[in-house]
């Protein structure tokens, strides 16, 4: 009669996270009498997974009916597998002993590898906005995947980027891994509608990569260009001066009119028009009663955009070129919410 052998026919088993792993084990004899135990790992630190004799193992079920007299199949199923379950599992036969059972023979072991999907990539940009022609960094992170092999790509508006660095951690063996990548992107004035995409491909995704996106609208600041012009005379003693604020982003903008350096009026951009590229235009105008001025007037349109230092544009209004009512101090009528008179 041959001495009992413990046979684990599978050297390795690959299971997707969340699924059930079947670990096969058979004995070649009914004796010696004694329980089978399953362990993860070997040596003194091994972890008990299942003990036929005693204990509660809610995730483990036996494949065959161990109550049958001639049963020699000690295969088990482990449910709801996670990456933390990865490792080498040993089926170990004990023989009955006094006072304790004695380890008799171990199977060769089955390596359980867990395929776990990466988490949805999270893309984050710089904390502060930057202006066109500047280079900004974006990071992409994804966690919890196994095995370690993974591919990460960066795109801007469908065009693959090449300036990025990627790390997969940890470097050594682990139950699961994380990927971290940093890409450098040069901003242009047309990037308000642009997107940066991080794409992660992994064996668990069956050719359907995961994507994380960041809108450059959260990152870019396009400073405005200013143009101050004098409109044709509306009335004999009134001049309309406009300040065209063009191609700015984001919308947060405050405009101040100065007359000879003195604040005349401050307003916040409200009814703006949007350009195709996502930037905004806005116009403010000032109705000047020239009869109130004896000397030339320097009108300044000062714009503070998105909390940045103010930019300004000035216009010299030649009072002498217009007829005046001497001594008149009559205010011109307001014709709009952003029309004001200078006295």
């Amino acid at each position: 009669e041959e001495e009992l052998q413990v046979i684990q026919p599978d050297k390795s088993v690959l299971v997707a996270a969340g699924e059930t792993a079947t670990l096969r084990c058979t004995a070649t004899s009914l004796i010696p009498v004694g329980p089978i135990q399953w362990f993860r790992g070997a040596g003194p630190g091994r972890e008990l997974i299942y003990n036929q004799k005693e204990g509660h193992f809610p995730r483990v079920t036996t494949v065959s009916d161990l109550t049958k007299r001639n049963n020699m199949d000690f295969s088990i199923r482990i449910g709801n597998i996670t990456p933390a379950d990865a490792g080498t599992y040993y089926c170990v036969k004990f023989r009955k002993g006094s006072p304790d059972d004695v380890e008799f023979k171990s199977g060769a072991g089955t390596e359980l590898s867990v395929r776990a999907k990466p988490s949805a990539p999270v893309v984050s940009g710089p904390a502060a906005r930057a202006t066109p022609q500047h280079t900004v960094s974006f990071t992409c992170e994804s966690h919890g995947f196994s095995p370690r092999d993974i591919t990460l790509k960066w795109f801007k508006n469908g065009n693959e980027l090449s300036d990025f660095q990627t790390n997969v951690d940890p470097v050594g063996e682990s139950v699961s891994y994380s990927i971290h990548s940093t890409a450098k992107v040069v901003l242009t004035r047309e990037d308000v509608h642009s997107q940066v995409i991080c794409e992660v491909a992994h064996v668990t995704l069956q050719g359907d990569p995961l994507r994380g996106t960041a809108n450059l609208s959260e990152t870019i600041r396009v400073p405005p260009t200013l143009e101050v012009t004098q409109q044709p005379v509306r009335a004999e003693n009134q001049v309309n001066v406009t300040c065209q604020v063009r191609k700015f982003y984001p919308q947060r903008l405050q405009l101040t009119w100065l007359e000879n350096g003195n604040v005349s009026r401050t307003e916040t951009a409200s009814t703006v028009t949007e350009n195709k590229d996502g930037t905004y235009n806005w116009m403010s105008w000032l109705l000047v009663n020239v009869s109130a001025h004896r000397d030339d007037v320097k009108l300044t349109c000062q714009v503070e955009h998105d909390g940045q230092p103010a930019v300004s544009k000035s216009h010299d209004l030649k009072v002498s070129a217009h007829p005046k009512e001497q001594g008149s101090n009559t205010a011109a009528e307001n014709t709009g919410s952003n029309e004001r008179n200078i006295y």
Epitope: E1, E3, V33, I36, Q52, L66, T67, K96, S98
Partner: antibody
């Protein structure tokens, strides 16, 4: 631990016999139990055993098909029913307890580590 | 099958060894059972190869190696005179017994 057998005596060939072993000082639900007999002038012969789970049983070829071993945990007894008695069934029948405390099924019904025996009950099959 | 000598003899105080050979190495446990007269209750003197039940004198010891078990009585006494049966099991027999060894103390 004590084991007490009863039910022996003079039996007629072809009739049935029921032997009872009452255990005390231990729980019969935790140990394999069995019957061993000794014919006059002969050695010990395994007859039948029942596992601690109460479901696995084994019989020697000489009695297979004629013997049934059962247990009653509440009464702490193990019963051997032997039908169609033959002259060669004559002998002293001993109840035996295995030493191994077993709480799982694949202890099966082995009696390879007997630590306690009953005093025996004599069975004579004769017409 | 288990094979043991039919008889051994010794003087009081001597050491006696009784062997029991299995036909293969798959007899993992051996027990030794003392019967002082035919039909009387056997007494287990050794089980689990080398374990001695409480109440059994320390002069009784056991060992097993491969397919052979040995009962050793160190300093045999007159009251040890009996028939000694070895017992074991294999995959098809829950219990098997040797034919018995008669120990005579001279």
């Amino acid at each position: 631990v004590t084991l007490d057998e009863s039910g022996g005596g003079l039996q007629t060939p072809g009739r049935a016999l029921s032997l009872v072993c009452r255990g005390s000082g231990f729980s019969i639900s935790s140990y394999n139990m069995g019957w061993v007999r000794q014919a006059p002038g002969k050695g010990l012969e395994f007859i039948a055993s029942i596992g601690s789970d109460g479901s696995s049983t084994h019989y020697a070829p000489a009695v297979k098909g004629r013997a049934t071993i059962t247990r009653d945990v509440g009464q702490s007894t193990v019963r051997l029913q032997l039908n169609n008695l033959r002259a060669e069934d004559t002998g002293t029948y001993f109840c035996a307890k295995d030493a191994y405390q077993c709480s799982y099924a694949t202890c099966n019904d082995y009696l390879d580590t007997i630590d306690a025996w009953g005093h025996g009950t004599e069975v004579i099959v004769s017409s | 099958a288990l094979t043991q000598p039919s008889s051994v003899s010794a003087n009081p105080g001597e050491t006696v060894k009784i062997t029991c050979s299995g036909d293969n190495s798959a007899h993992y446990y051996y027990g030794w059972y003392q019967q002082k007269s035919p039909g009387s209750a056997p007494v287990t003197v050794i089980y689990y190869n080398d374990k001695r039940p409480s109440g059994i004198p320390s002069r009784f010891s056991g060992s097993a190696s491969g397919s052979t078990a040995t009962l050793i009585i160190t300093g045999v006494q007159v009251e040890d005179e009996a028939v000694y049966f070895c017992g074991s099991a294999d995959s098809s027999n829950p219990a098997i017994f040797g034919a018995g060894t008669t120990l005579t103390v001279l």
